[in-house]
Interface confidence: medium
């Protein structure tokens, strides 16, 4: 009797695990074995697929085969007893495109009101994801063990901290990876549970803010208790998007180590231009608080949200105001990649009645003024970006007299 070729071959690839499954064509024939060959693109000859020769079951693993995962591969299978079936050819495929992302590894650390999540790809030194290991983003589902009400958090990176949790409470979570460059969504990790610790005696500092004074940055925060010391650390924010572990190290700000006030002042040249994360910790000598929530600190926005510089051209019934970029030390205008909106306040010198104009443009007309009258003007800049809500302080007031009548042109 002629052996029939096996049918319905499925290729399952999860991380670096290559599994083949197929259906027997004839269940009535016993002691049948199955063998696979493979062929790479541009090759004419077929090669025996190691790990998938003379298989008695309907599943085999060819993970040991060293393949270029970005190259197309073709497979064929046949049944063997005394004689052999004809070959059944499987549609060609590219392993990388077919691969699914396996469950990530998850390690949890508990604080009193926060959980730190360390996530790494499930397969260490994966061949499949060798070019993508640092491009993974993750999403998670977290719930209180007692309630089961789920909260989803999308687009997190390999280190993530969830704040505003309850002390001494068990939280459970599961995590899956995604590779957005390839539009791949992985499978969830097993569920991990952890209990938050007893409430710490010292809460973390809150409401951290950065401002610029002269050539210094001033970092301020709120704290519940007096007679404390504080330390501040920074991290380059670039590491959040692609966190290479060897560089993911928080560093001290030298002028903000063991400060006894709820603020510290450090020179602007401590930081190169860039975006950083800052965090603050409190200590009373015996105990330390957990770290505060991280704040984002952007040197460029701090620098250029100095008050705007402007010139006034006076007419009889209006002012034309020309806004320029503020100057940094060295008198060079700040590079302005952020969109700004300008708030202009003006008033008659003899009156307290202020009028306001909000304008995107850098040339603004202040209308309906009286001739030969002194008006004062001050301005400030705001970012228009939804992700950064910052405002400069007002510029110093500049006072000008309008021209005599009929010079409005």
């Amino acid at each position: 009797k002629n052996l029939k070729s096996p049918q319905k071959v499925e290729v399952d690839i999860i991380d670096d695990n290559f599994i083949l499954r197929w259906n027997r064509s004839d269940e009535s024939v016993g002691n049948v074995t199955f063998s696979f060959d493979y062929q790479k693109t541009g090759m004419d000859n077929w090669i025996k697929l190691s790990g998938c020769q003379n298989i008695t079951s309907t599943k085999c693993n060819f993970s040991s085969l060293k393949l270029n995962v970005y190259e197309e591969i073709k497979l064929r299978i046949r049944a063997e007893k005394e004689n052999t079936s004809s070959w059944y050819e499987v549609d060609s495929f590219t392993p990388f495109r077919k691969a699914q992302i396996g469950p990530p590894e998850v390690h949890l650390e508990a604080e009193d009101k926060a959980i730190v999540i360390h996530i790494s790809p499930g397969t260490k030194d994966s061949v499949m994801w060798a070019l993508d290991g640092l491009s993974f983003t993750y999403s998670l589902v977290i719930w209180k063990n007692s309630s089961g009400v789920e909260e989803r958090i999308e687009n997190i990176y390999s280190r993530h901290k969830i704040y505003k949790l309850s002390p001494e409470t068990t939280y459970c979570l599961k995590v899956k990876a995604a590779l957005l460059t390839s539009w791949k969504i992985g499978v969830y990790s097993p569920v991990h549970c952890i209990k938050t610790t007893v409430e710490n005696e010292l809460p973390p500092p809150e409401n951290i803010e950065v401002s610029v004074q002269n050539q210094n940055y001033v970092l301020k925060w709120d704290y519940t208790y007096a007679n404390m010391t504080f330390q501040v650390q920074w991290l380059h924010a670039f590491l959040k998007r692609n966190p290479g572990n060897h560089l993911y190290k928080w560093k001290q700000i030298p002028d903000c180590e063991n400060v006894k006030t709820t603020q510290c002042v450090f020179p602007q040249n401590v930081f190169q231009k860039g975006i950083y994360l800052l965090r603050v910790q409190a200590s009373d000598g015996n105990n330390t608080s957990f770290w505060s929530e991280e704040i984002k600190f952007d040197t460029e926005i701090q620098a250029f949200l100095l008050p705007p510089v402007f010139n006034i051209r006076s007419l009889s019934d209006s002012f034309h105001i020309y806004i320029g970029a503020p100057k940094q030390s060295g008198n060079t205008p700040v590079i302005q990649d952020y969109p700004l909106i300008y708030e202009i306040i003006f008033w008659e010198n003899t009156s307290n009645a202020e009028r306001k104009i909000i304008e995107k443009k850098t040339d603004v007309t202040v209308p309906n003024l009286k001739p030969l009258t002194v008006y004062c003007v001050k301005a400030r800049a705001h970012t228009m970006d939804e992700k950064l809500n910052k405002s400069s302080v007002f510029s110093d007031a500049v006072c000008e007299k309008t021209k005599p009548g009929n010079t409005s042109k």
């Epitope: 070019l131 640092l134 687009n155 990176y157 957005l180 460059t181 380059h236 924010a237 670039f238 590491l239 959040k240 998007r241 692609n242 966190p243 290479g244 560089l247 190169q272 231009k273 860039g274 975006i275 994360l277 984002k296 952007d298 460029e300 926005i301 590079i335 990649d337 952020y338 969109p339 970006d385 939804e386 992700k387 950064l388």
Partner: antibody
């Protein structure tokens, strides 16, 4: 002012390797990612991937995995694109571009572009 | 992948006219869309980012609008120097570009 200056045009044979440079000036090199784009003759722009100039980690778009490699010479504020085992279909102009102000974890528009490097692959 | 579709391959217009270039995203990209102008033999130049913010030095005849999946670049009072190809790009998740729309001046 901010500039990205790319190396000159290249004429290569199939199977050879090409390495294009992109020299940045006017800003702190390690604060902004460098992205690479391909534009085949008469075609649109295709994003090839980016390199994190702070960590040196590259990210490749699907169609550019395998033969393509991004690298850095941070001390010279220069990013490189290397293409191995060149094929005829690699004939294109390659652009490097710097992101605008980025927000960590997010992506930003491409604010500054190199002038482009034409790579011609022909037997 | 997020696909950006510019259905108009060419638009023919006259100096002084108002013209709209459209771009459709295959899924919601919020306002993370930029527009670039590319003249023959040159690199692309940023015109608009975050859907509607004009980039530094870009004339105010260029405006951007839209959100979610539908985006428009409008050029009012078209000038002869606007003859170029215009590309949209999403940066909500990595980067993808539209196929481009060539503006021809009659």
């Amino acid at each position: 002012q901010i500039q990205l200056v790319q190396s000159g045009p290249e004429l290569k044979k199939p199977g050879e390797t090409v390495k294009i440079s992109c020299k940045a000036s006017g800003y702190t090199f390690t604060n902004y990612g460098v992205n690479w784009m391909k534009q085949a003759p008469g075609k649109g722009l295709k994003w090839m991937g980016w390199i994190n100039t702070y960590t040196g980690e590259p990210t490749y778009a699907d169609d550019f995995k395998g033969r393509f490699a991004f690298s850095l010479e941070t001390s010279a504020s220069t990013a490189y694109l290397q293409i191995n085992n060149l094929k005829n279909e690699d004939t294109a102009t390659y652009f490097c571009a710097r992101e605008g102000v980025y927000y960590y974890g997010d992506w930003a528009w491409l604010a500054y572009w190199g002038q482009g490097t034409l790579v011609t692959v022909s037997a | 992948d997020i696909v950006m579709t510019q259905s108009q391959k060419f638009i023919s217009t006259s100096v002084g006219d108002r013209v709209s270039v459209t771009c459709k995203a295959s899924q919601n990209v919020g306002t993370n869309v930029a527009w670039y102008q590319q003249k023959p033999g040159q690199s692309p130049k940023t015109l608009i980012y975050s859907t509607s913010y004009r980039y530094n030095g870009v004339p105010d005849r260029f405006t951007g609008s839209g959100s979610g999946t539908d985006f428009t670049l409008t050029i009012s009072n078209v000038q002869s120097e606007d003859l170029a190809e215009y590309f949209c790009q999403q940066y909500n998740s990595y980067y993808t570009f539209g196929g481009g729309t060539k503006l021809e001046i009659k």
